[in-house]
């Protein structure tokens, strides 16, 4: 058993049929010695008396809020949560496996630049009685500070018969140099509590590997005389690291109709303009990627050919 | 400890081309190592990230773009002095700080060159003959060093009398290649910045 936060404890259980469970001793936080009784949740049934209560925790029915009282007055609470371990593996029932970039990916993180700011998100089908707490650091043995905000519900989607909820959190490394060469990864730890179930999820990454620039901005077209070609120009996104001559981007320019199966014109360039062939009912799209370290491409920025 | 904005004439920076070749060569070599040594811990997640130039050179700090010198987190107290005569400087106006940056890059290359050559000598003794260093990568390191053209004491190639542990050597190769790729990215960014200035 260990303390998650004040008055909230996590009991780690090997989860299999007829498991013996864990013996837990609760102590009432009071100077009083006599006349103390214990109850669980809303029940008035007295579970025991005395300053300590010993319980055998085997299942979710044994978890919950234990309260010690004296003469009708509440003295203190202890909330017991269960953390299940099945076949030596901690349970991952609360969050959905996003399977990208690999199986067992529950947390996904992205950074728009090298400032040390990043966003992580996760998915669940659970809609109520759900709380998250996020901590982060650079390295684990001698951790350096990363400050994370509160996790918030950022999107709801319908997937077949199910609703899916996306939560996200923003974090900022306390003293980040955009030009630094990372040797210790960022560690992100998410505590998830659903009713009386506790789970934790972790992710470890270098900012350089989770870079995904915002799409290029201010796309403009200029038709070329006596030709089917148009010159398309754009600018670096505002959120990208500066100076741009140091943090350079490379771009992919594509002309395509509405269907992915349609024919297309595609060209890669390090410049902020390109000449392509425009077709009726097609769009010109441009996306960006770090020129020197190939992490993710940005989403497309698009303008219609016409 | 930072680069001035007024540097060589645009497009006249001979090291940019070499630094692009360097990044390409080390990236290819790393990809080859990851494929060939697929049953060894050779991915970014699996290896320890070591920097053989730590406390010996200060490339990131010495080559910091002017715009980042206002960022407290980028200013490190480490100071290293180097010999300052380089042909990549391409202009008499080039400041001492830029010479410091380029000589720091030169020292990095020299250290990696020695490590890679020592390692290759060991890998050539491996009866499995599983992986060797790409001669193109070693040539590209050499070309960039020549373009930088700094006078510097030659570092003797390390020789070891004991029987090489090929497993450890291959893991060290992965660690070195990962670190060198990160440094090659920094070098490319620096050369691009200098070329644009």
């Amino acid at each position: 058993i260990w303390e998650l936060k004040k008055d909230v404890y996590v009991v780690e259980l090997d989860w299999y049929p007829d498991a013996p469970g864990e013996m837990v001793v609760l102590t009432c936080d009071t100077p009083e010695e006599d006349g103390i009784t214990w109850t669980l949740d809303q029940s008035s049934e007295v579970l025991g008396s005395g300053k300590t209560l010993t319980i055998q925790v085997k299942e979710f029915g044994d978890a919950g809020q234990y309260t010690c009282h004296k003469g009708g007055e509440v003295l203190s609470h202890s909330l017991l949560l269960l953390h299940k371990k099945e076949d030596g593996i901690w349970s991952t029932d609360i969050l959905k496996d996003q399977k990208e970039p690999k199986n067992k990916t529950f947390l996904r993180c992205e950074a728009k630049n090298y400032s040390g700011r990043f966003t992580c998100w996760w998915l669940t089908t659970i809609s109520t009685d759900l709380t998250f707490s996020v901590k982060s650091s650079r390295g684990s043995s001698d951790p350096q500070g990363v400050t994370c905000g509160a996790a918030t519900l950022s999107a709801e989607r319908v997937r077949g018969d199910n609703k899916e909820y996306e939560y996200s959190v923003e974090c900022q490394e306390d003293s980040a140099c955009p030009a630094a060469e990372e040797s210790l990864p960022i560690e992100v730890m998410v505590d998830a509590v659903h009713k009386l179930k506790y789970e934790n999820y972790t992710s470890s990454f270098f900012i350089r590997d989770i870079i995904k620039p915002d799409p290029p901005k201010n796309l403009q077209l200029k038709p070329l005389k006596n030709s089917r070609q148009v010159e398309v120009s754009w600018e670096y996104p505002d959120t990208w690291s500066t100076p741009h001559s140091y943090f350079s981007l490379t771009f992919c320019v594509q002309v395509q109709g509405k269907s992915k199966r349609e024919k297309k014109d595609r060209v890669f360039t390090d410049k902020t303009s390109a000449t392509v062939i425009c077709r009726k009912n097609a769009s010109i799209s441009v996306r960006a990627q770090d020129r020197y370290y190939s992490s993710s491409w940005s989403e497309w920025a698009s303008v219609p050919c016409s | 400890r930072n680069l001035p904005v007024a540097t060589p004439d645009p497009g006249m920076f001979p090291c940019l081309h070499h630094s692009q070749n360097l990044l390409r060569a080390v990236s290819n070599m790393l990809q080859k190592a990851r494929q060939t040594l697929e049953f060894y811990p050779c991915t970014s997640e699996e290896i320890d990230h070591e920097d053989i130039t730590k406390d010996k050179t200060s490339t990131v700090e010495a080559c910091l773009p002017l715009e980042l010198t206002k960022n407290e987190s980028c200013l490190n107290s480490r100071e290293t002095s180097f010999i300052t005569n380089g042909s990549c400087l391409a202009s008499r106006k080039t400041s001492f700080m830029m010479a410091l940056c380029l000589s720091s890059i030169y020292e990095d290359l020299k250290m990696y060159q020695v490590e890679f050559k020592t390692m290759n000598a060991k890998l050539l003794m491996d009866p499995k003959r599983q992986i060797f260093l790409d001669q193109n990568m070693l040539a590209v390191i050499d070309e960039l060093m020549q373009a930088l053209n700094f006078n510097s004491e030659t570092v003797p190639q390390k020789s070891s009398l004991e029987e090489p542990d090929f497993y450890k050597t291959k893991i060290k190769l992965c660690i070195l290649l990962h670190a060198f790729r990160i440094r090659a990215v920094t070098i490319d960014r620096v050369m691009s910045y200098l070329n644009a200035s």
Epitope: R228, R261, K263, K264, R266, V267, F268, T269 | -
Partner: antibody, heavy 118, light 107 residues
Framework: QVQLVQSGAEVKKPGSSVKVSCKAS????????LHWVRQAPGQGQEWMGW????????EYAPKFQGRVTITADESTSTAYMELSSLRSEDTAVYYC???????????WGQGTLVTVSS | DIVMTQSPLSLPVTPGEPASISCRAS??????LHWYQQKPGQAPRLLIA???QSISGVPSRFSGSGSGTDFTLTISSLQPEDFATYLC?????????FGQGTKVEIK
């Protein structure tokens, strides 16, 4: 299986014209750009131009502008390349090639040898 | 027009050995470079698109690298069927242009 089948070899006199055909099978004809590329004996490949069979849009290499005409007939899934004012240096194997991507070629015809000789 | 220069023009290689062919552009073309294989009396066959993207059906021994002006096609271990002429082609701008070809011959 996508295939491009070209017309047979031609022998032409200088100053005359030649029209080479390229019939496509497999896939929808108008879903691809169609190019013409030539290779003179002992020389490298030379790109001549492309057509979008969907709308008839064409673009030609400046070297051939005014001398080459590329057309397409959607009803027969056939593209044509006509080269006029032939000279001996136009002796080459002419290839048609196609792709959904405009700027490179994933399927080629077998080639048509055009010999220009007096 | 962008001029594409291949080297060497002829490359004698022992079967089973690796081979590298170089292609240089007269100006920077990013990764807009494609590689083809051509055998005598046959049409070219696409091997690599955009400098390094493999093409389905092409053996994994063929790989490409490079960007800007310098590109390389590598054949990790030459098989008897790989002896042919290899062409590079730029797609950075029109007119599309090809290298003059590198003939890989049996040593």
């Amino acid at each position: 299986q996508v295939q491009l089948v070209q017309s047979g070899a031609e022998v032409k006199k200088p100053g005359s014209s030649v029209k080479v055909s390229c019939k496509a099978s497999g896939g929808t004809f108008s879903d691809y750009y169609l190019h013409w590329v030539r290779q003179a004996p002992g020389q490298g490949q030379e790109w001549m131009g492309w057509i979008d069979p969907e709308n008839g849009d064409t673009e030609y290499a400046p070297k051939f502008q005014g001398r080459v005409t590329i057309t397409a007939d959607e009803s027969t899934s056939t593209a044509y390349m006509e080269l006029s004012s032939l000279r001996s240096e136009d002796t080459a194997v002419y290839y048609c090639a196609r792709n959904k991507e405009l700027r490179y070629f994933d399927v080629w015809g077998q080639g048509t040898l055009v010999t220009v000789s007096s | 027009d962008i001029v594409m220069t291949q080297s060497p023009l002829s490359l004698p290689v022992t079967p089973g050995e690796p081979a590298s062919i170089s292609c240089r552009a007269s100006q920077s073309i990013s990764i807009n470079l494609h590689w083809y294989q051509q055998k005598p009396g046959q049409a070219p066959r696409l091997l690599i698109a955009f400098a390094s993207q493999s093409i389905s059906g092409v053996p994994s021994r063929f790989s490409g690298s490079g960007s800007g002006t310098d590109f390389t096609l590598t054949i990790s271990s030459l098989q008897p069927e790989d002896f042919a002429t290899y062409l590079c082609q730029q797609s950075n701008s029109f007119p599309l242009t090809f290298g003059q070809g590198t003939k890989v011959e049996i040593k």
